[in-house]
Interface confidence: low
């Protein structure tokens, strides 16, 4: 079967059930439903999934049976619209059910909530989890899929199956270990952190497709795959880009069965053709399907062919540049991006896209000029400042990170970003700035050649979190502007923002700075978040506070927490010393 060249099927649901198998079919339908109806109880979703599965089985037995010819959107949408409490739980989302496909599915997609009002997932004791795992493994794993999917409505579904497989493996191994906790907890921490990162990366892909269109996503994919597979010819890269775009369009559009099926086909194609793609794929291609797909997605860049010829010959010196550009603009720009990216694994994808955009803009201008060649002859000179800007920024920030360490580096970013966009909610500023700060430990350890792709492409993912959270409740025109004007210039746009002089400082509220003994029982991470929340609030009250003033207040605050957590009567200490701290802080900041 050629990749994505399928015969017409009488029953799409039967076709996908047969392709994916019952286990994956059920898991993917559960993910799809949980990503759409994020507030529904687990048991309700399981019931819906079982009903859909039984129906699919009847269609496998007889593809001509009643309703088997309906599209998956129709079948799944009809099923979601049977939920009795739709209006009470989801409000206007219930209006989607009055629409016909494809508008109904589009309506459901628009109501996906990136920040659903759901309780924080609390990890039970290890023995409790192991008992639950042994009592009913299937339900335990379904619950994992459900809880992740409803909190991350754009999580890449086939990748979530891979996470679930690792989750199961962790419990299978560790629940029979001598020290269950020592075995299991690090594995769960790793899965949690990797899962959050995977969710954020996929969210950017979906934002790219949904907000900026297929062309933007394809450009990103050409650049990234050309870096990863520099020996693959342009046609091969382009084919992979076309297929990858289809996969992600499907997943971002809620077509999870098609997405998972097509991702499996793409992995199969890549492995069958690895000789013409990359020498780094051999190990990946020996793995089972889910591991194989994950491995391919994360595979290291192949070695660049040595001494590739100068780009100038085809893209600057050739007299046919404008003719070729006019004949097939996207192909020509795609070739430019491919050729540039395969030569520059040391550049971030967003930088490569900025260079391609500059090249495109220059050709648009110059190919209409009297002497096109004279006009575009110096186009590569325009690239220099674009390359130097992220290089310098990364150098400065890595130096700062190395001086301060992660926590204090995050605090510096908290202050910086709160001053830029003080209207943004404190939890969002804390979450985004903490993640921005993680760029230090993630990327600064790398040699120069790997720093920029690591740092700037990671920052794109984090800033997209800010953009999607802000889109839900827009409060800052500056954030809206940076998020919507250009996908590839988001980071430079935020970097260029200065202190918002129009911001009216927040009224001082002592309650914001009142702390209790419960802070002493928090983990180090949660304690940091409390302190960082206070820091953001301080800046919102006093945007013109200097670094020194803020540092003094934060040092006093840290000492206050440490002192009271050691006290016999912690609560009294927090009450009395807290009042003193608030007064001293107000005085220090001139509030």
């Amino acid at each position: 079967r050629g990749v994505f060249r399928r015969d017409a099927h009488k029953s799409e649901v039967a076709h996908r059930f047969k392709d994916l198998g019952e286990e994956n079919f059920k898991a993917l339908v559960l993910i799809a439903f949980a990503q759409y109806l994020q507030q529904c109880p687990f048991e309700d979703h399981v019931k819906l999934v079982n009903e859909v599965t039984e129906f699919a089985k009847t269609c496998v037995a007889d593809e001509s049976a009643e309703n088997c010819d309906k599209s998956l959107h129709t079948l799944f949408g009809d099923k979601l619209c049977t939920v009795a409490t739709l209006r009470e739980t989801y409000g206007e989302m219930a209006d989607c059910c009055a629409k016909q496909e494809p508008e109904r599915n589009e309506c459901f997609l628009q109501h996906k909530d990136d920040n659903p009002n759901l309780p924080r997932l609390v990890r039970p004791e290890v023995d409790v989890m192991c008992t639950a795992f042994h009592d009913n493994e299937e339900t335990f794993l379904k619950k994992y899929l459900y809880e992740i999917a409803r909190r991350h409505p754009y999580f890449y579904a086939p990748e979530l199956l891979f996470f679930a497989k690792r989750y199961k493996a962790a419990f299978t191994e560790c629940c029979q270990a001598a020290d269950k906790a020592a075995c299991l907890l690090p594995k769960l921490d790793e899965l949690r952190d990797e899962g959050k990162a995977s969710s954020a990366k996929q969210r950017l892909k979906c934002a790219s497709l949904q907000k900026f269109g297929e062309r933007a996503f394809k450009a990103w994919a050409v650049a990234r795959l050309s870096q990863r597979f520099p020996k693959a010819e342009f046609a091969e890269v382009s084919k992979l880009v076309t297929d990858l775009t289809k996969v992600h369009t499907e997943c971002c559009h809620g077509d999870l069965l098609e997405c998972a099926d097509d991702r499996a086909d793409l992995a199969k194609y890549i492995c069958e053709n690895q000789d013409s793609i990359s020498s780094k794929l051999k190990e990946c291609c020996e793995k089972p399907l889910l591991e194989k797909s994950h491995c391919i997605a994360e595979v290291e860049n192949d070695e660049m062919p040595a001494d590739l010829p100068s780009l100038a010959a085809d893209f600057v010196e050739s007299k046919d540049v404008c003719k070729n550009y006019a004949e097939a603009k996207d192909v020509f720009l795609g070739m430019f991006l491919y050729e540039y990216a395969r030569r520059h694994p040391d550049y971030s994808v967003v930088l490569l896209l900025r260079l391609a955009k500059t090249y495109e803009t220059t050709l648009e201008k110059c190919c209409a000029a009297a002497d096109p060649h004279e006009c575009y002859a110096k186009v590569f000179d325009e690239f220099k400042p674009l390359v130097e800007e992220p290089q310098n920024l990364i150098k400065q920030n890595c130096e700062l990170f190395e001086q301060l360490g992660e926590y204090k580096f995050q605090n510096a970013l908290l202050v910086r970003y709160t001053k830029k966009v003080p209207q943004v909610s404190t939890p969002t500023l804390v979450e985004v700035s903490r993640n921005l700060g993680k760029v230090g430990s993630k990327c600064c350890k790398h040699p120069e050649a790997k720093r920029m792709p690591c740092a700037e492409d990671y920052l794109s993912v984090v800033l997209n979190q800010l953009c999607v959270l802000h889109e839900k409740t827009p409060v800052s025109d500056r954030v809206t502007k940076c998020c919507t004007e250009s996908l590839v210039n988001r980071r430079p746009c935020f970097s260029a923002l200065e202190v918002d002089e129009t911001y009216v400082p927040k009224e001082f509220n002592a309650e914001t700075f009142t702390f209790h003994a419960d802070i002493c029982t928090l983990s180090e991470k949660e304690r940091q978040i409390k302190k960082q929340t206070a820091l953001v609030e301080l800046v919102k009250h006093k945007p013109k506070a200097t670094k020194e003033q803020l540092k003094a207040v934060m040092d006093d605050f840290a000492a206050f927490v440490e002192k009271c957590c050691k006290a016999d009567d912690k609560e009294t200490c927090f009450a009395e010393e807290g009042k003193k701290l608030v007064a001293a802080s107000q005085a220090a900041l001139g509030l």
């Epitope: 020996k231 010819e233 342009f234 046609a235 091969e236 382009s238 084919k239 069958e272 053709n273 000789d275 013409s276 020498s279 070695e303 062919p305 040595a306 001494d307 590739l308 010829p309 046919d320 003719k323 070729n324 004949e327 097939a328 192909v331 795609g334 070739m335």
Partner: antibody, heavy 119, light 111 residues
């Protein structure tokens, strides 16, 4: 100056083995694919296969798979085409070409090696 | 049996224009313009004259031009000259095994 220089003409008997060569100079030999092309008397050109000397990644056109072996020695910038057992139908001119960018674009060619197989 | 189809021969008088067609270009090769044209004199090696459908390598006369429509590529030679008499072959990306294919070749005769 980029050059591809092929070994001289060969006259062989059916069943004999043969290895012809193509030496590249004037460019980084490991950076470009090398393709081999057959042209039987009075006939058109046929791509036989390609090799990337940098890592000896080799691919064959379906009709030549198993019939010939393509190899390269990057230490002496030379690509090879060999037969383990020649047939009369292997009589042809064989060309090597440097492939630039995509595999359908041969920008520099060897002068050709004429192979005659006759009993 | 070539995957690309060319007329066996074409002819034209000096100064005229002629066009040689090459049909059977795969959709993949077509969408990314992966078609080349070669000129070959008897007993000599082929010479690249057009690549990526329309591009001419440096040193190739601008009388040679390439184009494509659907799954057919074309080579046009304008202002025909006596020394254009040669065999012309198209070549294109063949798909998954990543080895190109040639057309059967077209003999151009300048009358």
């Amino acid at each position: 100056e980029v050059q591809l220089v092929q070994s001289g003409a060969e006259v062989k008997k059916p069943g004999e083995s043969l290895k012809i060569s193509c030496k590249g100079s004037g460019y980084s030999f490991t950076s470009y694919w090398i393709g081999w092309v057959r042209q039987m008397p009075g006939k058109g050109l046929e791509w036989m296969g390609i090799i990337y000397p940098g890592d000896s990644d080799t691919r064959y056109s379906p009709s030549f798979e198993g019939q010939v072996t393509i190899s390269a020695d990057k230490s002496i910038s030379t690509a090879y085409l060999q037969w383990s057992s020649l047939k009369a139908s292997d009589t042809a001119a064989y060309y090597c070409a440097r492939l630039h960018g995509v595999v359908s674009r041969g920008d520099y060619w060897g002068q050709g090696t004429l192979v005659t197989v006759s009993s | 049996q070539s995957a690309l189809t060319q007329p066996a021969s074409v002819s034209g008088s000096p100064g005229q224009s002629i066009t040689i067609s090459c049909s059977g270009i795969s959709s993949l090769a077509g969408s990314y313009n992966l078609v080349s044209w070669y000129q070959q004199y008897p007993g000599k090696a082929p010479k690249l004259i057009i690549y990526e459908v329309t591009k001419r390598p440096s040193g190739v006369s601008n009388r040679f031009s390439g184009s494509k429509s659907g799954n057919t590529a074309s080579l046009t030679i304008s202002g025909l000259q006596a020394d254009d008499e040669a065999e012309y072959s198209c070549s294109s990306y063949a798909g998954r095994n990543a080895v190109a294919v040639f057309g059967g070749g077209t003999q151009l005769t300048v009358l």
